[in-house]
Interface confidence: medium
């Protein structure tokens, strides 16, 4: 058992152009909070899959109000760590999702109270009990800096929190077969709680609840001595029926040591000698350094000279993630203005501009009305890359050259007759109808039936925002 701890250092605009607008304003003050979701192994990072290792929500940060027009600075953060307790062994390899949420505090009634600002995800190797690992992740134009670690809750110790430690009973040394607990040298490694009744002299366990027998003993609780007179081999799993030691695999058979570790038998079990860059009971945990080349796609590795110090990958343009493992969809930042089409060519971004716009990011609005004339007193209106004429009354068409007949569209309902007028049109309604367009029937009692508002939503099942 233990606790995964996450410390958020900063959340703000990332480097480079296109700084995001502040999520808060004088009209809409807000505060941030964070959610972390952990999953064991290199599992799916999809936000919807369950947080099998656990999840945590931070406290709310201080209320923040941005000055109008100012770029977003690093935003004020909640106090304290995010802590995710884990009950079983720490897996060594895990996936994380960290979400930054905004809580709106403005005086508005509509809309949800919360909105997601950024979500980052990654996969990491981490030994419990190790130092804080630092990380930087980007989501769109935002950048999140954080540190994390896994620590065991006493009495558990070790890189997976599976070993147990107890205070020494004797002041000088630990009991037979028990090692001092590094780094707590004044404590001793305690035997795991084995299956009830497991012989303390002839049995042992590597997992809680099991009972494995030392050489020469057999039975479910290792209480039956093995008769070796009729046996050929001096070791192997015991046969409870014959009381004879049957040849079988030793603890190193099949090499339980991962990542090229070498196995050696011990009186109780086995021991792995791990190659450089790996540690743990079975060499399953990677202590990655820059020498191991952890940065992909041409990323530059900095720091991390030894397994106890974290490394940072500086990614080339177009890549992100702690190991530069993710290609950036640069078009997701919507760099092309005014409805331009974004093309990510790998080496560069290209914007294909709509008519009436130009520039590398379609930022220049061409003067649509230059050299254009609207007839009959019409005025030219720019917009959307094409000029448009706002025509004087009685004229229409692209350049206001056509005489407009306001009655051409038959605007009077229920058989009303239309008359062109200098101010537009007038409807003379048929008997039984009224209104500017003769749209309302007149009831015999003189009351008019006005149209009902469209029906609203009906309450239904739970709806999801995301």
């Amino acid at each position: 058992a233990g606790v995964f701890e996450l410390q958020i250092h900063s959340f703000g605009p990332g480097p480079g152009p296109g700084a995001p607008r502040s999520p808060c304003s004088a009209r809409l003050p807000c505060r941030l909070f964070f959610r972390v979701c952990l999953k064991p192994g290199l599992s799916e990072e999809a936000a919807e899959s369950p947080c099998a290792l656990g999840a945590a929500l931070s406290a709310r940060g201080p209320v923040y109000t941005e000055q109008p027009g100012a770029p977003a600075p690093d935003l004020p953060l909640p106090d304290g760590l995010l802590q995710v307790p884990f009950r079983d062994a720490w897996p060594g390899t895990f996936s994380f999702i960290i979400e930054t949420w905004r809580e709106e505090l403005g005086d508005q009634i509509g809309g949800p109270a919360w909105s997601l600002l950024a979500r980052v995800a990654g996969r990491r190797r981490l030994a419990a009990g190790g130092p804080w690992a630092r990380d930087i992740q980007r989501a769109g134009a935002w950048e999140l800096r954080f540190s994390y670690r896994a620590r065991c809750e006493p009495p558990a110790v070790g890189t997976a929190c599976t070993r147990l430690c107890r205070p020494r009973s004797a002041p000088s040394r630990c009991g037979p077969g028990l090692r001092p607990c590094a780094p707590l040298e004044d404590e001793c490694e305690a035997p795991l709680v084995c299956r009830a009744g497991c012989s303390p002299e002839h049995g042992f366990c590597e997992q809680p609840g099991e009972c494995r027998c030392l050489e020469g003993w057999t039975g479910p609780l290792c209480t039956v001595p093995v008769s070796t007179s009729s046996c050929l081999s001096p070791r192997g799993p015991s046969s409870a029926t014959t009381g004879c030691l049957v040849p079988g695999p030793g603890p190193c058979d099949g090499n339980p040591c991962a990542n090229g570790g070498s196995c050696s038998e011990t009186p109780r079990s086995f021991e792995c000698t791990c190659p450089r860059g790996f540690y743990g009971l079975r060499c399953e945990v990677s202590g990655v350094t820059c020498a191991d080349g952890p940065c992909f796609n041409g990323g530059l590795c900095v720091g991390g000279a030894d397994p106890d110090s974290a490394y940072i990958c500086h990614c080339p343009p177009g890549f992100q993630g702690s190991n530069c493992e993710k290609r950036v969809d640069r078009c997701s930042l919507q760099p092309c203005r005014n409805g331009g089409l974004c093309l990510d060519l790998g080496h560069a971004l290209r914007c294909r501009c709509r008519a009436g716009f130009a520039g590398p990011r379609c930022e220049h609005d061409l003067d649509d009305c230059a050299g254009r004339a609207c007839a009959n007193g019409g005025t030219c209106v720019e917009g959307g890359g094409a000029h448009r004429c706002s025509c004087a009354l009685g004229f229409g068409g692209r350049d206001c050259r056509e005489r407009a007949d306001p009655c051409a569209a038959r605007p009077c309902a229920h058989g009303g007759r239309c008359y062109a007028h200098f101010s537009g049109l007038v409807c003379a309604c048929a008997p039984g109808y009224m209104g500017a367009r003769c749209e309302f029937p007149v009831h015999p009692d003189g009351a008019s039936a006005l149209p009902a508002a469209p029906p609203g939503l009906r309450p239904g099942d739970p709806q999801r925002y995301l």
Epitope: L105, P112, A113, L116, P462, Q463, Y465, L466
Partner: nanobody, 116 residues
Framework: QVQLVESGGGLVQPGGSLRLSCAAS????????VNWYRQAPGKEREKVAR????????NYANSAKGRFTISRDNSKNTLYLQMNSLRAEDTAVYYC?????????WGQGTLVTVSS
């Protein structure tokens, strides 16, 4: 399972008062923003009042300002709406709704009729 149950509706004369309650169960009520909505016959549903998860922030529609008060008791998982100076145009089915950043839930509604 998740439930929101409104109560306290009924017939009241213009100028009178009513207190609506909404009892929540099956989810972590204290982490949700909660709202009162209403829907009059033939009209769109409108949000009347909103209160943040901790109860520190309240918002009201213009039609409710100065007359309605929204409150909550997280220890009892209950939302309230105190309605004073009721008018005929307040006649509607009133719904409570709980919303958070990942989900939202609705009650079935309670009818408020303001008539002399």
């Amino acid at each position: 399972q998740v439930q929101l149950v409104e109560s306290g509706g009924g017939l009241v004369q213009p100028g009178g008062s009513l207190r609506l309650s909404c009892a929540a169960s099956g989810f972590d009520f204290s982490t949700y923003t909660v709202n009162w909505y209403r829907q009059a016959p033939g009209k769109e549903r409108e949000k009347v009042a909103r209160i943040s998860s901790t109860g520190t922030t309240t918002n009201y529609a213009n039609s409710a300002k100065g007359r309605f008060t929204i409150s909550r008791d997280n220890s009892k998982n209950t939302l309230y709406l105190q309605m004073n100076s009721l008018r005929a145009e307040d006649t509607a089915v009133y719904y409570c709704a709980a919303e958070r950043f990942d989900s939202n839930y609705w009650g079935q509604g309670t009818l408020v009729t303001v008539s002399s």
